[in-house]
């Protein structure tokens, strides 16, 4: 399907302009590529009419131009003193008129109404309020008002001053009339409709002194607004209303094949299921007027959206409504990134988020959608640091792999985190994607000690047991703040013959602390990724405390929650039999290791990398 | 943490004008929706105006409707409170607000980050 996308029907009358916007990819070959506007001929040849290559055919000479966009990838035809011949079957599009870079546009000029002279003009969209004003003489002024419709060669009352309303106007209309000295009387008539179209008749008084005036009431289906948006991209629809509709229940609904409108959100709470997780209705304002946000846009969001007021949070026929005809293009310049992201309880994930490359200095954000109260999303981290304490120790957002892509990574999961995520920046608001993170059953691949206590002073060693589809990783320790998570110094492992054939059940990297400071209470990750892509992560917490038992011969530097399956050891290290674990956070064969030798050398924080067997030697 | 500050309080003649100002640091708060309480010696603290984060949705308290707009300047990190008409009854500490909301319906219960107050006093 073509890229190119404009208006599919565009009516005018005689005598009168159009301006023709057509949308395109905004490429940089697309940008300078030529455009034009062309009629289809019955051969099915496309005669160019006008282009952005200074053409103009004589038929359109003095009347029409072309202005490309390309900052922005449109391109407007403007076509003025339209005639009858006009209408016709035309293609605006990109490089050579054959090529099938275009969209088909339907153009219909119709002869104007032929009025009454003095009639005045009302042009309403439908749904809308229109006042129309009746000037009278003051010998009518106490003698009866009314206005009649004019239908064919008839006149039907619609209403008069003695308390008539007709009944296709009932609870919409009023006729008012103003005090003594003003000579007009109005007559309001609320929520049009599109059968309201038509020549009325005011008249005051009767017989051969009668004040008459025609009206022409035209109620218009408004225009839908085009919009262009990237598929997997976002689009917001802004709406308003007015103020006679501030306190109505508001929706959003897209045009079915059968020209009914399906809801796709309101006010009321009622929410298509094919936008879960990727739609947002925003508060509106007091001005009534409210606006839509949809993420993670697919081919087949594609359609005629109306946005109205109603007190059953749907369409109703005199209600105002706005229009957009969304396209959604394929062409995208928003990355595939999965949509779907799958953990284990107690495990990790680590999600990529698309941002535009040409806003790397963005401030990037991850909230978490909530489906209540027509959706909300509250920030979770910000490119600045966490922002909700609840996800403390186990959630970060980092800046790689950069040119495009953030990452952001949670871990300690629970069946709580299943749910939808925004990934979002404070740039191109059209950049907003949605990813959904499902728990899965299984068990996580890093393993690492529960909660951890050292002792000041001591030496500390957390392994980290990892698989052999783990080995060809480079494996990390980093010691997580709010700002994010500052990798631990490690000696670079380079390639290790304990990996090369690896047949063991696991792997072991491990952080030593020595000595232990107060400074070292916190969140410790080990994970694992590949060049900028991280993978896995788990969580140790380490707190800190002072030395318990002065003179003794060892003192434990480590000591790990208890586990039902667990003993410890009078060495002062913890072990687990190979048993099924129900805490995911201990593992089969773990050893907290205590090292009380020479401490005086060796570094502050060491990340030392060995098969389980081998956790002395580190791999170099 | 977002730090809230407000500033332009003051004494006022009834039928006055003030505009309060809450400048934010520590980060931006260009997601963040804002919103303005007021607590009244003796009172319970109150809701009067809030912002979303683009500035193009606000919501009024009944009290204040047609007296107090409230405005954002992201680029300044900057929430505004124009009073206008003000009233004896106005009289209060007010207080900026900021809630980690990128989007959506935030209640008044949502607000998490606080600013230390400014009174604004209304003679009659």
């Known amino acids: 399907k073509s890229p190119v996308f404009g208006p599919q029907e565009v009516s005018s009358v005689e005598g009168n302009s159009v301006s023709i916007k057509c949308y395109y990819p905004p490429t940089s070959v697309n940008r300078h590529t030529r455009k034009y506007w062309c009629r289809k001929g019955a051969s099915g040849r496309c005669i160019t009419l006008v282009s952005s290559e200074g053409y103009v055919s004589s038929n359109y000479a003095g009347r029409a131009n072309l202005t490309n966009f390309p900052e922005n990838g449109t391109f407007v035809v403007n076509i003025a003193q339209l005639s009858r011949d006009d209408s016709g079957h035309y293609k605006c599009g990109l490089g050579i008129n054959s090529r099938g870079l275009s969209f088909d546009v339907s153009l219909e000029v119709s002869q104007g109404p032929e009025l009454p002279n003095g009639t005045e003009v009302y042009t309403v969209d439908v749904g809308r309020t229109v006042t129309i004003k009746c000037p009278f003489k003051t010998e009518n002024a106490p003698k009866t008002k009314a206005l009649y419709k004019k239908i064919g060669q008839t006149s039907v009352l619609v209403i008069d001053s003695r308390n008539y309303v007709n009944p296709n106007y009932k609870d919409r209309i009023r006729l008012r009339i103003p005090g003594t000295g003003q000579l007009i009387f109005t007559v309001v008539i609320d929520r049009l409709r599109l059968s309201d179209h038509g020549l009325y008749l005011c008249q005051a008084g009767d017989g051969s002194n009668r004040d008459e005036k025609n009206a022409d009431l035209q109620v218009l289906e408004p225009e839908p607004e085009l919009v262009y948006e990237d598929l997997r991209g976002s689009v917001t629809f802004h709406c308003a209303l007015g103020l006679e509709v501030a306190n109505v229940a508001k929706f959003l609904c897209r045009v079915n094949s059968r020209e009914t409108c399906d809801v796709v959100i309101n006010t009321l709470g009622k929410r298509d299921s094919a936008f879960e997780g990727r739609i947002l209705l925003n508060p509106q304002d007091k001005d009534g007027s409210f606006s839509v946000v949809i993420t993670g846009l697919r081919k087949e969001d594609e359609g005629r959206y109306l946005c109205g007021a109603h007190s059953d949070g749907q369409l109703q026929e005199g209600w105002p409504i706005q229009a957009w005809q969304l396209f959604v293009n394929e062409e995208s310049t928003i990355p595939r990134s999965p949509t779907v992201v799958k953990g284990v309880a107690g495990g990790s994930v680590a999600v990529l988020c698309p941002y535009n490359p040409k806003e790397s200095q963005s401030l990037k954000y991850w909230c978490l959608w909530e489906g209540a109260q027509n959706g909300r999303c509250p920030l979770l981290v910000e490119s600045q640091g966490l922002v909700q304490e609840q996800y403390e120790g186990r959630l970060s957002l980092l800046q790689e792999p950069g040119n495009g892509t953030f990452t952001v990574i949670l871990n300690q999961l629970t069946t709580q985190d299943a749910g939808f995520y925004w990934c979002l920046t404070n740039g191109d608001t059209r950049w907003r994607t949605t990813v959904e993170i499902k728990i899965i059953e299984g068990e996580p691949n890093l393993k690492v000690p529960g909660n951890v206590t050292a002792v000041l002073g001591e030496t500390l060693n957390i392994p980290c047991h990892f698989p052999c589809k783990f080995s060809s990783y480079e494996k990390y320790w980093c010691k997580w703040s709010n700002t994010g998570c500052q990798t631990l110094p490690s000696q670079d492992e380079g390639p290790s013959e304990a990996f090369v054939n690896c047949d063991e059940n696991s792997r072991l990297v491990s952080l030593t602390l020595n000595p232990v400071t107060r400074a070292d209470e916190g969140w410790y990750w080990c994970g694992v990724k590949q060049g900028h892509f991280y993978g896995e992560t788990a969580a140790v917490y380490v707190a800190v405390e002072e030395k318990k038992v002065a003179g003794s011969r060892y003192v434990s530097p480590a000591k790990a929650d208890a586990a039902p399956d667990e003993k410890v050891l009078d060495s002062g290290v913890r072990e687990i039999e190979n048993k099924a674990i129900q805490d995911p956070r201990l593992f089969a064969e773990e050893k907290v290791v205590a090292d009380t030798g020479d401490q005086a050398g060796g570094s502050r924080a060491s990340v030392d990398s060995s098969s389980s067997e081998e956790q002395g030697g580190s791999s170099k | 943490e977002v730090q809230l500050v407000e500033s332009g309080g003051g004494l006022v003649q009834a039928g006055g004008s003030l505009r309060l100002s809450c400048a934010a640091s520590?980060?931006?708060?260009?997601?963040?929706?804002m919103g303005w309480f007021r607590q009244a010696p003796g009172k319970e603290r109150e809701f009067v105006a809030r912002?979303?984060?683009?500035?193009?949705?606000?919501d009024y308290a009944d009290s204040v409707k047609g007296r107090f707009t409230t405005s954002r300047d992201n680029a300044k990190n900057t929430v505004y409170l124009q009073m206008n008409g003000l009233k004896p009854e106005d009289t209060a500490v007010y207080y900026c607000?900021?809630?980690?909301?990128?989007?959506?319906?935030?209640?008044?219960?949502?607000?998490?980050?606080w600013g230390q107050g400014t009174l604004v006093t209304v003679s009659s």
């Open positions: 607000a900021g809630s980690a909301y990128y989007s959506g319906y935030v209640t008044h219960r949502d607000f998490g980050s």
């Open positions: 520590g980060r931006t708060i260009n997601t963040y929706v």
């Open positions: 912002i979303d984060w683009s500035g193009s949705s606000t």
